[in-house]
């Protein structure tokens, strides 16, 4: 309930906010949950706490884990959890689902794409913007404050947009990138029974105990703007929100429009520090619209350890 997912790339700055809010004068203590070790507040540290914010300058893959923040108010302490995952940089241009922020939709009249999480950082204009990893050039694109405006939006403007900016902390500069999908609303659309693209029904995914894993639930619902189109994960038939395990978190549903114009939605279930008991759960990807509900089930299995026995006698 009081947990939030945050993610970033290694060697970039990542700033995380405590999910519990309070007055600016309240003291906030941060801990690394697994060791209960206090996070220092001295800025000379690579990872340090600054009030409601936890700063990784820069982040490393080993920083991944659950962090506890305690907001100390006069009458009681409020505890929150920040579930942080730091990923290695992708060698190719493709940005995986688990690094994507929520999708925005645009039309000819309104085509603002906000740079996600930028308000947490100390940055100065201008922002750099990329579409499918290509730097945006031309008079149609205007970087304004923390958002991008596209003039005369067309359907082929849909795609993945990445903003890149520099965070400054005490004179040192750190790069930050964030990516989100942009879809273009199609006036002429239709709706149909949901088709789940992933996972396949009764699929089994191999995982390693102690590692992090992500499950993507992706479904298509027709073409153009949809009145109702939702995807979600369930655990053993229960909503994620009813399942009080901060290691397992579902992102908000994310719209995606593919080249064929289909309106598709996906959501990622993030499981941190996979445990034996996670293998016993049934993971249901649910896709729902006005036409009905479709369900695909996936289970987790333990990855067989590599046989390290010698091949010599």
């Amino acid at each position: 309930k009081f947990s939030k997912q945050s993610w970033g790339l290694e060697n970039e700055a990542l700033i995380v906010r405590c999910p519990r809010q309070g007055k600016s004068s309240y003291i906030v203590d941060w801990y690394y949950s697994q060791t209960n070790k206090s996070i220092p507040t001295q800025e000379r540290n690579r990872v340090f706490a600054s009030g409601q914010l936890l700063k990784f300058l820069p982040a490393e893959v080993a920083d991944s884990g659950i962090y506890t923040c305690i907001v100390r108010s006069p009458t009681f302490n409020r505890t929150g959890y920040a579930n942080v995952t730091i990923y290695k940089k992708q060698p190719d241009c493709n940005v995986p689902d688990y690094l994507m922020y929520s999708t925005v939709s645009g039309s000819e009249k309104n085509s603002k794409i906000y740079c996600p999480t930028i308000d947490l950082y100390n940055w100065t204009a201008p922002l750099e913007w990329f579409k499918n990893c290509q730097a945006l050039q031309g008079s149609r694109y205007k970087a304004h404050k923390s958002f991008l405006v596209i003039d005369n939006v067309m359907t082929d403007d849909a795609g993945d947009y990445t903003c890149k900016f520099i965070h400054n902390e005490n004179g040192a500069n750190y790069s930050v990138t964030a990516t989100r999908s942009f879809t273009v609303k199609d006036e002429q659309g239709f709706s149909r029974f949901p088709v789940i693209r992933a996972p396949a029904h009764n699929e089994t995914k191999e995982v390693e105990i102690g590692e992090n894993t992500n499950l993507t639930c992706s479904a298509c619902f027709g073409k153009g703007a949809q009145f109702l189109a939702t995807v979600q994960w369930q655990l053993n038939g229960n909503k994620i929100t009813d399942f009080s395990e901060p290691r397992i978190q579902q992102e908000e549903g994310q719209n995606q429009s593919f080249s064929n114009g289909l309106a598709c939605v996906n959501t990622v279930l993030r499981i941190a520090d996979v445990k034996e008991e996670d293998l016993l759960l049934r993971y249901d990807c649910l896709a729902l619209n006005l036409h009905g509900l479709r369900r695909h089930t996936i289970r987790l299995s333990r990855k067989n350890p590599i046989d390290h026995q010698s091949t010599y006698c």
Epitope: R17, P19, R20, P74
Partner: antibody, heavy 116, light 113 residues
């Protein structure tokens, strides 16, 4: 500049439901909680509770549990107050106020009149 | 709940006079964790939302004239207007900003002679 813009006045009958909105602008919405304060005509101020705008968690004052619901639409930087099964004593001006050391920013208020 | 008691309920003063009003809380509003007193003062004019004047018992909100001063600690607090102006006609509320439920005093109505 920071602004909290509330929806317009409402005239309702007892037993009906009202939902009023408070749209924030000029700051990062999810950085600050939002409080709701009630002021009946000619009376003093009553704190109703607040909502955590980052995770959507509401906290209600003792006299405002049950018929009252706080909600939010993060993408629109908007919080909502819904009052169900309206009673005559719900007639009041309702203010949203941004959390902080003291409430430095207030909406203009929404007058809800409950009358048969 | 913390009860906030304001006195007097109303005051009538002339322009230029000094005025003080009192606010007492039923429990201490001092937080030992940071030595802050969580008390706020507001001014409310007819048909308007309250305006924050003072927070932390004595810190003046940005843009508030320096004729407004807050003082006190623990359970006893005072708002002083050093030289009342015509535009100060309003109701003044103190607020427990310390713990839930945040409670307001009954107000002091300032009238100009």
């Amino acid at each position: 500049q920071i602004q909290l813009a509330q929806s317009g006045p409402e005239l309702k009958k007892p037993g009906e439901t009202v939902k009023i909105s408070c749209k924030a602008s000029g700051y990062t919405f999810i950085n600050y909680g939002m409080n709701w304060v009630k002021q009946a005509p000619g009376k003093d101020l009553k704190w109703m509770g607040w909502i955590n705008t980052y995770i959507g968690e509401p906290t209600y004052g003792d006299n405002f549990k049950g018929r009252f619901a706080f909600s939010l639409e993060t993408s629109a930087s908007t919080v909502y107050l819904q009052i169900n099964n309206l009673k005559n004593e719900d007639t009041a001006t309702y203010f949203c106020a941004r959390e902080g050391d003291g409430f430095a920013y207030w909406g203009q208020g929404t007058l809800v009149t409950v009358s048969a | 709940d913390i009860v906030m008691t304001q006195s007097p309920p109303s005051l009538s003063v002339s322009v230029g006079e000094k005025v003080t009003m009192s606010c007492k809380s039923s429990q201490s509003l001092l937080y030992s964790g940071n030595q802050n007193n969580y008390l706020a003062w507001y001014q409310q004019k007819p048909g308007q939302p309250p305006k924050l004047l003072i927070y932390g018992a004595s810190t003046r909100e940005s843009g508030v004239p320096d004729r407004f001063t807050g003082s006190g600690s623990g359970t006893d607090f005072t708002l002083t207007i050093s030289s009342v102006q015509a535009e100060d006609l309003a109701v003044y509320y103190c607020q427990n900003d310390h713990s839930y439920p945040y409670t307001f005093g009954g107000g002091t109505k300032l009238e100009i002679k």
